[in-house]
């Protein structure tokens, strides 16, 4: 590894009302020449490591979390790895980790609070 991928998420929890959609923001800085084929993006529940959503091998692998998650595919190449969580439920409250691997890797956790 040449150096860790820096992953940025908001410090403050994301607050969402039950039934609304929430965006869990996550970003990284692509190096010059970066291609989506190099990207491994994995969203997981921080504590259990349960898979939530992933993007690997150049394509969106889809939601593994009750089919209520989506990426922003048009923004991925610019380093936007944010996750959209639809129809938020009380049970969704907790910490989500955004894990980004290109040549090296990095991760950061964002908290979701449900009101």
């Amino acid at each position: 590894p040449t150096g860790a991928v820096e992953v940025q998420v908001p410090e403050d929890p994301v607050v969402a009302l039950v039934g609304t959609d929430a965006t869990l923001r996550c970003s990284f800085s692509p190096e010059p020449g970066f291609s989506l084929a190099q990207l491994n993006l994995i969203w997981q529940l921080t504590d259990t490591k349960q898979l939530v959503h992933s993007f690997t091998e150049g394509r969106d692998q889809g939601s593994a979390y009750a089919n209520r998650t989506a990426l922003f595919p048009d923004l991925l190449a610019q380093g936007n790895a944010s996750l959209r969580l639809q129809r938020v439920r009380v049970a969704d409250e907790g910490s989500f980790t955004c894990f980004v691997s290109i040549r090296d890797f990095g991760s950061a956790a964002v908290s979701l609070q449900v009101a």
């Epitope: 898979l51 692998q61 593994a64 980790t97 956790a109």
Partner: antibody, heavy 116, light 108 residues
Framework: QVQLQESGPGLVKPSGTLSLTCAVS?????????WNWVRQSPGKGLEWIGE???????NYSPSLKSRVTISIDKSKNQFSLKLNSVTAADTAVYYC?????????WGQGTLVTVSS | EIVLTQSPGTLSLSPGERATLSCRTS???????LAWYQQKPGQAPRLLIY???SRATGIPDRFSGSGSGTDFTLSISRLEPEDFAVYYC?????????FGQGTKVEIK
């Protein structure tokens, strides 16, 4: 290139506390990564012990949670492991490693023997 | 916790031969949540494959990974003398992360 190096006593008495430190060089410990301890004993193979994030958040293996503490010292670019109430079953090579999912790189490992 | 079972325990082969190592998980996991490591005597494990099939930096293309669900495979197309070692699989789809017991690839 990030490199890790474990250090600490190679011999600990039964019921005592095992204390190890992992020095991180070639990069900052404050980067977006989790820092882990993994051990390897002949009887149990590779066993994940726990991890810490630069914010101080920790996760521990359920089987060791009651005896383990992992801490981080960002000013010294190092993190540490404490395992208390040790027995002969804790004799192992202890590795530090970087990663939230897979582990890369690893330290070279340090053998800790629990014996009186 | 998820238990990983590797087979065979030992694989005796000659340089130039193909090696096929198996890793079975006690619960189905997404393929992107599995890694493989190589360990030589007196050394730390070295990451070979992550995401079931992506080679880590600097790993020769004779190493390849595949699989999904509960069955995963590490293949070495043509064994080189430096490939004789112990290989471990590891899952990271559930906490705690767990490893297989290892497969030793030895010279026949």
């Amino acid at each position: 290139q990030v490199q890790l190096q474990e250090s600490g006593p190679g011999l600990v008495k039964p019921s005592g506390t095992l204390s190890l430190t992992c020095a991180v060089s070639g990069g900052s410990i404050s980067t977006s990564n989790w820092w882990n301890w993994v051990r390897q004993s002949p009887g149990k193979g590779l066993e994940w012990i726990g991890e810490i994030y630069p914010t101080g958040n920790t996760n521990y293996s359920p089987s060791l949670k009651s005896r383990v503490t992992i801490s981080i010292d960002k000013s010294k670019n190092q993190f540490s492991l404490k395992l208390n109430s040790v027995t002969a079953a804790d004799t192992a090579v202890y590795y530090c490693a970087r990663g939230y999912n897979w582990f890369d790189p690893w330290g070279q490992g340090t053998l800790v023997t629990v014996s009186s | 916790e998820i238990v990983l079972t590797q087979s065979p325990g030992t694989l005796s082969l000659s340089p130039g031969e193909r090696a096929t190592l198996s890793c079975r998980t006690s619960q189905s996991i997404n393929g992107i949540l599995l890694a493989w490591y190589q360990q030589k005597p007196g050394q730390a494990p070295r990451l070979l494959i992550y995401g079931a099939s992506s080679r880590a930096t600097g790993i020769p293309d004779r190493f390849s990974g595949s699989g999904s669900g509960t069955d995963f495979t590490l293949s070495i197309s043509r064994l080189e003398p430096e490939d004789f070692a112990v290989y471990y699989c590891q899952q990271y789809g559930s906490s705690p992360r767990t490893f297989g017991q290892g497969t030793k690839v030895e010279i026949k």
